[in-house]
Amino acid sequence: MMTGTIETTGNISAKKGGSVILQCHLSSTMAQVTQVNWEQHDHSLLAIRNAELGWHIYPAFKDRVAPGPGLGLTLQSLTMNDTGEYFCTYHTYPDGTYRGRIFLEVLESSVAEHSARFQIP
């Protein structure tokens, strides 16, 4: 039975040209996290973090995605095209798969706020 919940940074905004941290956190389960996959709204993969094999950043994002902090992802040099949904998929044993959603809005405005409160989607 899957007892865990994914907490995410929820809806966040960041400034064009800036950077943002995408974070998910799995709680309320003793399951072992074997892998975390980060994906964009169009199903393209940004990165994979495997517990043993480490990080793998995908070619389209090699220059502007940095692994971490932790199991999270730092997206740099933001463009307006980065606006949209991001998904973290936690592969765990023995529970199975958990998925969290973050919505990122990239703003032209110089007063873009980066809200980073954790919330359960």
């Epitope: 994906e39 199903h43 393209s44 480490g54």
Partner: antibody
Amino acid sequence: EVQLQQSGPELVKPGASVKISCKTSGYTFSDYTLHWVKQSHGKNLEWIGGFNPNNGGTNYNQKFKVKASLTIDKSSNTVYMELRSLSSEDSAVYYCARNWAFDYWGQGTTLTVSS
Amino acid sequence: DIVMTQSHKIMSTSLGDRVNITCKASQHVSTAVAWYQQRPGQSPRLLIYSASYRHTGVPDRFTGSGSGTDITFTISSVQTEDLAVYYCQQYYTTPWTFGGGTKLEIK
């Protein structure tokens, strides 16, 4: 030039063990994961497991966890795979390959298990 | 484990033809898919990674597309040297798994 040079063919008896090697060159050893793949009957490909030379992490396909053991010698940029309790089902060609998508492959090591 | 199904075991084609080889994943694999070519007596060779990126030195007649569960590999104009077995592989989650292969042959 990236190269993965594997050890030669092996003929072993059922129940025995064998250790095959894959010596790498032409790139920074710790920068890429290394994997082992089994090809049976010249067709079916199966991922056995992978090794991260950077952190020493090893990830096995559950199917091969008892059968295979992956080790490394950083001083010679070589990875090894030991196969235990061999049977005719283990007769196959075994390849080492680099990276998550296997961008470079060894030439293959043919293992024949026969009495 | 994720099952990668290549429905066509053998595809017959003529030189110069356009060929699509399909691979269906039993679960979502996003774009974590590679395509390999294996000629008789040789090791597999990476052609496409991350579903649509050509590996170094691979001719541009080879392309890959798709994501999720439906992945396609295309040869725009088949040449003699393309007659081989083609395998898809997912590395979205371990254990990484391969399709059963599609053999490309001349009619």
